[in-house]
C-alpha cells in the first residue's frame, strides 16, 4: 500500500478580518493510526492551533465529522480572523505511540494572509490660521490595514496635489499597518470654500476608496481691505464718514474709530454681508460735527481682525472747507455724532 500523504491543496489563502478561514487538509490513507494536529509555523517554535484528540480550541471547528471511521478530511475552520492570525499553517499527521504520539508527516503548509480595512482617513490642518500666498501643511492618517500595500492621494477641490510625503509604518513586518502623509498647500484668497481631500485606496475597499476632508475655512485668514470715504449730509455742519471693510474671513472683527489719535468708539462687526467666495464685507459710519472743530480732523478707522495686529486707514477732514456755526468756538458740542454702524456691502 502506498505511504500516507498529507495534502494541503492551498498554497495560500487570503481572508478579510472578522471572517472565517478554512484551511484544507486531506490524507491519502487511514494508516498509520494516529491523530492530526494543526500548527502555525514549523520547527521548535511552532504553535499548536488544533489537536484532534485533546485540548480546547474555541475558535476552531472541523469541517468534517472526525469521529467517522473512514474520515480522511481534516480541514479546519478558524472563526473571527484577525491580522494576528496571519502565518503558515501546517496539517501534521501523527502516528500512535506510547507514551506520546510520534510525528509522521506534514503537509506543505498554507500561508494565511489577513486583509484588514484601513480606518477612515483623518485629515488635520495647522493649529493656527494662515493668510493667502502662504504654504500650509495638512496631515492624513489611517490605521489598522493589512496587507501593507496602500495608495494615498491628495486633492484640493478635485485637483490632485503633488507636493506630499507619505510613510507606511512600521517599515518591517506587522499584523497591521498605518499610513501617515503630509501635504503642502498654497492658500489663495478664494480658498474659504475650498476643501482638501485625502483619498486612501486598499485591496480591502474593492475600488471604493476612503476619503477624509478638511475645510480650508478652518485654516485660512483673509485680511480685510479698508476704505474710508466721506459724503456730505443734509445738515451743513455734518459730514458722514464711512469705513468699508471688505473681503475678510473669518467674521471675527473689531473696529475702532479714532479722532486725531484718540479713541472715540469701538464696535464689533455684526450684520455682515457674505460674498460669493465666502469672505465678508462690513461698513461702519460716523456723523462728524465739523463746526465743533477749529482745526482739521484726522479720522482713523482701525480694524483688528481675528486677533491679528490692527490695520488702519485714515482720512483727513478739512475743517476750513466748511462754514462754521456761530458760537461754535464757545460751545462746540460733540465733535462726533453718535451714529450706529450701518450694515450693507460697500
Amino acid at each position: 500500500e502506498e505511504e500516507l500523504q498529507v495534502i494541503q491543496p492551498d498554497k495560500s489563502i487570503s481572508v478579510a478580518a472578522g471572517e472565517s478561514a478554512t484551511l484544507h487538509c486531506t490524507v491519502t490513507s487511514l494508516i498509520p493510526v494516529g491523530p492530526i494536529q494543526w500548527f502555525r509555523g514549523a520547527g521548535p517554535g511552532r504553535e499548536l492551533i488544533y489537536n484532534q484528540k485533546e485540548g480546547h480550541f474555541p475558535r476552531v471547528t472541523t469541517v468534517s465529522d472526525l469521529t467517522k471511521r473512514n474520515n480522511m478530511d481534516f480541514s479546519i475552520r478558524i472563526s473571527n480572523i484577525t491580522p494576528a492570525d496571519a502565518g503558515t499553517y501546517y496539517c501534521v499527521k501523527f502516528r500512535k505511540g506510547s507514551p506520546d504520539h510520534v510525528e509522521f508527516k506534514s503537509g506543505a503548509g498554507t500561508e494565511l494572509s489577513v486583509r484588514a480595512k484601513p480606518s477612515a482617513p483623518v485629515v488635520s490642518g495647522p493649529a493656527a490660521r494662515a493668510t493667502p500666498q502662504h504654504t500650509v501643511s495638512f496631515t492624513c492618517e489611517s490605521h489598522g490595514f493589512s496587507p501593507r500595500d496602500i495608495t494615498l492621494k491628495w486633492f484640493k477641490n478635485g485637483n490632485e496635489l503633488s507636493d506630499f510625503q507619505t510613510n507606511v509604518d512600521p517599515a518591517g513586518d506587522s499584523v497591521s499597518y498605518s499610513i501617515h502623509s503630509t501635504a503642502k498647500v498654497v492658500l489663495t484668497r478664494e480658498d474659504v470654500h475650498s476643501q482638501v481631500i485625502c483619498e486612501v485606496a486598499h485591496v480591502t475597499l474593492q475600488g471604493d476608496p476612503l476619503r477624509g476632508t478638511a475645510n480650508l475655512s478652518e485654516t485660512i485668514r483673509v485680511p480685510p481691505t479698508l476704505e474710508v470715504t466721506q459724503q456730505p449730509v443734509r445738515a451743513e455742519n455734518q459730514v458722514n464718514v464711512t469705513c468699508q471693510v471688505r473681503k475678510f474671513y473669518p467674521q471675527r472683527l473689531q473696529l475702532t474709530w479714532l479722532e486725531n489719535g484718540n479713541v472715540s468708539r469701538t464696535e464689533t462687526a455684526s450684520t455682515l454681508t457674505e460674498n460669493k467666495d465666502g469672505t465678508y464685507n462690513w461698513m461702519s459710519w460716523l456723523l462728524v460735527n465739523v463746526s465743533a472743530h477749529r482745526d482739521d480732523v484726522k479720522l482713523t478707522c482701525q480694524v483688528e481682525h481675528d486677533g491679528q495686529p490692527a490695520v488702519s486707514k485714515s482720512h483727513d477732514l478739512k475743517v476750513s472747507a466748511h462754514p462754521k456755526e456761530q458760537g461754535s468756538n464757545t460751545a462746540p458740542g460733540p465733535a462726533l455724532a453718535s451714529a450706529a454702524p450701518l450694515g450693507g456691502s460697500g
Epitope: 509555523g41 514549523a42 520547527g43 521548535p44 496571519a86 506534514s106 506543505a108 513586518d173
Partner: antibody, heavy 122, light 112 residues
Framework: QVQLQESGPGLVRPSETLSLTCTVS????????WSWIRQPPGKGLEWIGF???????FYNPSLKSRVTISLDMSINQFSLKMTSVTAADTAVYYC????????????????WGQGTTVTVSS | DIVMTQSPLSLPVTPGEPASISCKSS???????????LDWYLQRPGQSPQLLIY???NRASGVPDRFSGSGSGTDFTLKISRVEAEDVGVFYC?????????FGGGTKVEIK
C-alpha cells in the same frame, strides 16, 4: 535578496553586557528563526540561540543564564544581549536566518551576516 | 545535547579529484517524519559560513551539483565529486533536529 548586518561595540569590558543588533533588509521576518552564532578566534562555530517570528526563544543551555534574544518585527531587527562577559566570550558574532518548512526540525541556516568581532578586554 | 563528530580534521585535496567528509551524531537525526535534520556548511577563509546541504541530502539554492550529501540516522557524508580551488575552507556539519543546535568541529580542506 535578504541581507543581514550586525552592529554593536567591538570592545566590551569584562563583567559588562555585550549588546549586538542585527538588521534584516530585503525580506520578511515572518516564518523564520533568527539566530546568533559565534566563533572564537581560530575555533569552530557555537550556536548561542534563536528567536522565532512569533517571539518564542531558544537558547544554548551553556549560555542561557546570560543571554537574551529579542525581536522587533516593526523595524526588521533582532538583538543579542549577553551579560557578565569574560575573555572567553571574545569571538566573531554572526546573525543568521534559519528556515523551517515542516515538522519539528529546521531546514538550513541559509543567510548569514558578515560577522562582527567582539573583544572582551579591560 | 547531541554531539557531532567530524573526520578528518584536515583534508589535503587535488583539484579535479573527489573528496569526502564524514559526520557522526551521538543520536539519530532521522525524525519520525522521515527527514534527517543535518546541514553542511562551508566557511571560506575570511568569510561567513554558507549553507551547502540541508535535511542530509538537499542542495541549497545556488550550490553547485558537485556537492552532495548522503546518510541517515547517525552517519552522514558530504562528497565533492571534483574539487575546485574555490572549495578550500572549513566544512562544518550541524544537527538541526533539536536545540541546542550543535556543530561538528570542522574539516579543513586545502589544496595539496
Amino acid at each position: 535578496q535578504v541581507q543581514l548586518q550586525e552592529s554593536g561595540p567591538g570592545l566590551v569590558r569584562p563583567s559588562e553586557t555585550l549588546s549586538l543588533t542585527c538588521t534584516v533588509s530585503g525580506g520578511s521576518i515572518r516564518n523564520y528563526y533568527w539566530s546568533w552564532i559565534r566563533q572564537p578566534p581560530g575555533k569552530g562555530l557555537e550556536w548561542i540561540g534563536f528567536i522565532y517570528y512569533n517571539g518564542r526563544t531558544f537558547y544554548n543551555p551553556s549560555l542561557k543564564s546570560r543571554v537574551t534574544i529579542s525581536l522587533d518585527m516593526s523595524i526588521n531587527q533582532f538583538s543579542l544581549k549577553m551579560t557578565s562577559v569574560t575573555a572567553a566570550d571574545t569571538a566573531v558574532y554572526y546573525c543568521a536566518r534559519v528556515r523551517a518548512y515542516s515538522g519539528i526540525g529546521l531546514d538550513g541556516t541559509d543567510v548569514w551576516g558578515q560577522g562582527t568581532t567582539v573583544t572582551v578586554s579591560s | 545535547d547531541i554531539v557531532m563528530t567530524q573526520s578528518p580534521l584536515s583534508l589535503p585535496v587535488t583539484p579535479g579529484e573527489p573528496a569526502s567528509i564524514s559526520c557522526k551524531s551521538s543520536q539519530s537525526l532521522l525524525y519520525s517524519n522521515g527527514y534527517a535534520y543535518l546541514d553542511w556548511y562551508l566557511q571560506r577563509p575570511g568569510q561567513s559560513p554558507q549553507l551547502l546541504i540541508y535535511q542530509g541530502s538537499n542542495r541549497a539554492s545556488g550550490v553547485p551539483d558537485r556537492f552532495s550529501g548522503s546518510g541517515s540516522g547517525t552517519d552522514f557524508t558530504l562528497k565533492i565529486s571534483r574539487v575546485e580551488a574555490e572549495d578550500v575552507g572549513v566544512f562544518y556539519c550541524m544537527q538541526a533536529l533539536q536545540t541546542p543546535l550543535t556543530f561538528g568541529g570542522g574539516t579543513k580542506v586545502e589544496i595539496k
